[in-house]
């Protein structure tokens, strides 16, 4: 589909005759015919196959043809085709004299025809005018001409039919041969697959629209090259997805199993050594000084109770001091300034000189214990329960009463969070669902029994005689430190005479 | 191909018994961990329990402790999941899966579950 375009330039009609020779009265009113057929080696009369156009009066004898294409489209003169254009053509030019305003051929006298011209040859399809001037004896015409394509119509013959579309159907528009051009972003034979974002996986990502990534189900990312794990997967990552690979330190099906607590948590204070014991559980190993699972807890030097014979300890910054009670001294109060003649031996005990007679020891019969023999045997004074279980006398034998989490004869056996004893200062540990409680002793608290609330165990008076009473801050325990002439725990005894013990 | 088949599922009342199977395919039994994990309606899949190669080593979600027992028959090519006083709360779709290696660390391969349901 095209047009045939024909621009009228000029006529030249000087005389102002008709092709008979006879005159115009009062002058030629020139209108034209044209009429546009296929290729004729002669050009002949008969049906104008590709189309016919007539003009109006475009002047008297000798004119100029403005172009009017901006105007009413007249000049130049359209003929328009709907078929591939052949590339060759014949054209037929009448110029007519109306004598009145009806230009039909039928109303026109057939002398009114003032000249004709008949041409044909071949034309190609492009935007280029051809210009010709066709000479009889008595005018003259100028002319131009040229095929070009109907919208929409591409091609050396019109025949390729393009319309430019941005739509699902396609993206593109026409190219001068009819060829498709696709709009930036699209791609495929007719302009309908996006282009999507550069480095988009192309198995695992897709688009339906340029410069989209979308993923995949099982993937990930900005350019859908990441895999997702299996839902739950903790500290674990994917090479496929819904995978879960653990991480170093990491176990369990969904990696949430701490394999490595200790460099995760680093749990183990003061300088302590931590050592992984399997998930979840770690063990500290204190360095000297320290206490408590995390190894939290400075330890105090009288802590381990090294004054002997009731002495009191008191904590020095380079150690530690022993106040010894009335007739003890040393280091650790471990020397007598008593003697056998002096009967220290209570319960029936057997006194014996050491040292010549600069000190004594005293053999205790069954039952009784002590450097005087003056404490009735407790079976559980050596505290054989470990793991803070209560130790009952029974007679002649003892037992074990475990607290939760514990068992064994001695409790030695554990079976809970409580096996590590957390709970500092003789406080009672208790196994809770998700850890354990510590139940503190009187004169300590804290979430482990660390922290001394001292309390004032000589308030109760607990010492006889005019006895000095000493609080020992390790044990919240009283010390009776007695005059000349007292001895006992609580200076309760005179020197020399025996008690009767109620047991 | 590696394929894991769980059956056994059903339903069952309060403080009664199940025991899953799991029977493996497309792959050497005895050079891969198995584990089992659960899921029920609208919340995150909970690994209960997994036995590693050589059946040595076993772990237990502290949810299922002491009423669950895992174990693996190399002849059968079957791993079983004992459940005991089982609870509304265990009511879920019960998988049967291994990480691929020989300890348990991962889900590489899993089945397609069976439902277990705990109601009076």
């Known amino acids: 589909s095209g047009v045939f375009q024909l621009q009228l330039q000029e006529f030249i009609n000087e005389r102002g005759v008709l092709a008979s020779g006879r005159p115009c009265e009062p002058g030629c009113r020139t209108f034209f015919r044209v009429c546009l057929k296929h290729f004729q080696a002669v050009v002949s009369p008969g049906p104008c196959t590709f189309g016919t156009v007539s003009t109006p009066v475009l002047g008297t004898n000798s004119f100029a043809v403005r172009d009017d294409s901006s105007g009413g489209g007249r000049n130049p003169l359209q003929l328009p085709f709907n078929f591939t254009w052949p590339g060759t053509f014949s054209l037929i030019i009448e110029a007519w004299h109306a004598p009145g305003d009806d230009l039909r051929p039928e109303a026109l006298p057939p002398d009114a025809l003032i000249s004709k011209i008949a041409i044909q040859g071949s034309l190609a399809v492009g935007q280029n005018w051809l210009l010709d001037e066709q000479t009889s004896t008595l005018t003259r015409l100028r002319y131009s001409y040229r095929v070009i394509c109907s919208d929409n119509y591409y091609g050396d013959n019109c025949s390729r039919l393009c319309k430019k579309r941005n739509d699902h159907f396609g993206h593109y528009v026409c190219q001068p041969d009819g060829n498709l051009s696709c709009l930036p972003g699209w791609t495929g034979e007719y302009c309908q697959q996006p282009i999507c974002l550069s480095g988009c996986h192309e198995q695992n990502g897709y688009c339906s629209k340029p410069a989209e990534c979308l993923c995949r189900p099982g993937w990930q990312g900005r350019l859908c090259n990441e895999c997702i794990p299996h839902n739950g997967c903790r500290h674990g990552t994917c090479s496929t997805p819904w995978q879960c690979t653990c991480d170093e330190g990491w176990g369990g099906l969904f990696c949430d199993q701490d394999l490595n607590y200790c460099t995760h948590h680093s749990p183990c204070k003061n300088g302590a050594t931590c050592s992984n014991s399997g998930q979840r559980s770690y063990t500290c190993t204190c360095r000297p000084g320290y206490t408590g699972v995390d190894c939290e807890l400075e330890l105090s030097e009288c802590d381990s109770n090294p004054c002997r014979n009731g002495g009191s300890c008191k904590d020095q910054e380079d150690g530690y001091h022993c106040l010894c009670p009335p007739g003890y001294y040393g280091l650790h109060c471990e020397h007598s300034t008593l003697s056998c003649a002096d009967s220290p031996c209570f319960n029936g005990g057997s006194c014996r000189e050491r040292n010549q007679g600069a000190n004594y020891a005293c053999e205790c019969p069954p039952n009784f214990t002590g450097s005087n023999c003056e404490k009735k045997v407790d079976r559980c004074t050596s505290n054989p329960c470990a793991n803070g279980g209560q130790c009952l006398n029974r007679g002649p034998s003892r037992m074990c009463r475990c607290r939760p989490g514990f068992t064994g004869t001695y409790c030695e056996l554990h079976v809970s969070d409580c096996a590590r004893n957390p709970c500092a200062h003789g406080g009672t540990c208790h196994d809770l669902e998700n850890g354990l409680m510590c139940t503190c002793p009187a004169g300590f608290s804290g979430r482990r029994c660390e922290v001394r609330t001292s309390i004032d165990a000589c308030a109760s008076s607990p010492c006889f005689n005019r006895a000095t009473c000493y609080t020992d801050l390790s044990t919240d325990t009283f010390v009776c430190n007695c005059p000349y002439g007292f001895v006992g725990s609580r200076c309760e005894f005179p020197v020399g005479l025996p008690p009767s013990f109620p047991w | 191909e590696v394929q894991l088949v769980e059956s056994g599922g059903g339903l069952v009342q309060p403080g009664g018994s199940l025991r899953l199977s799991c029977t493996a395919s497309g792959f050497t039994f005895d050079v891969y961990a198995i584990g089992w994990f659960r899921q029920a309606p609208g919340k995150e899949p909970e690994g209960i329990s997994c036995i590693s190669s050589s059946g040595s080593i076993t772990y237990y979600a502290d949810s299922v402790k002491g009423r669950f027992t895992t174990s693996r028959d190399s002849a059968k090519n079957t791993v079983y999941l004992q459940m005991n006083s089982l609870k509304p709360e265990d009511t879920a779709v019960y998988y049967c899966?291994?990480?691929?290696?020989?300890?348990?660390?991962?889900?590489?391969?899993w089945g397609q579950g069976t439902q277990v349901t705990v109601s009076s």
């Open positions: 899966a291994t990480p691929g290696i020989a300890a348990c660390r991962g889900i590489h391969y």
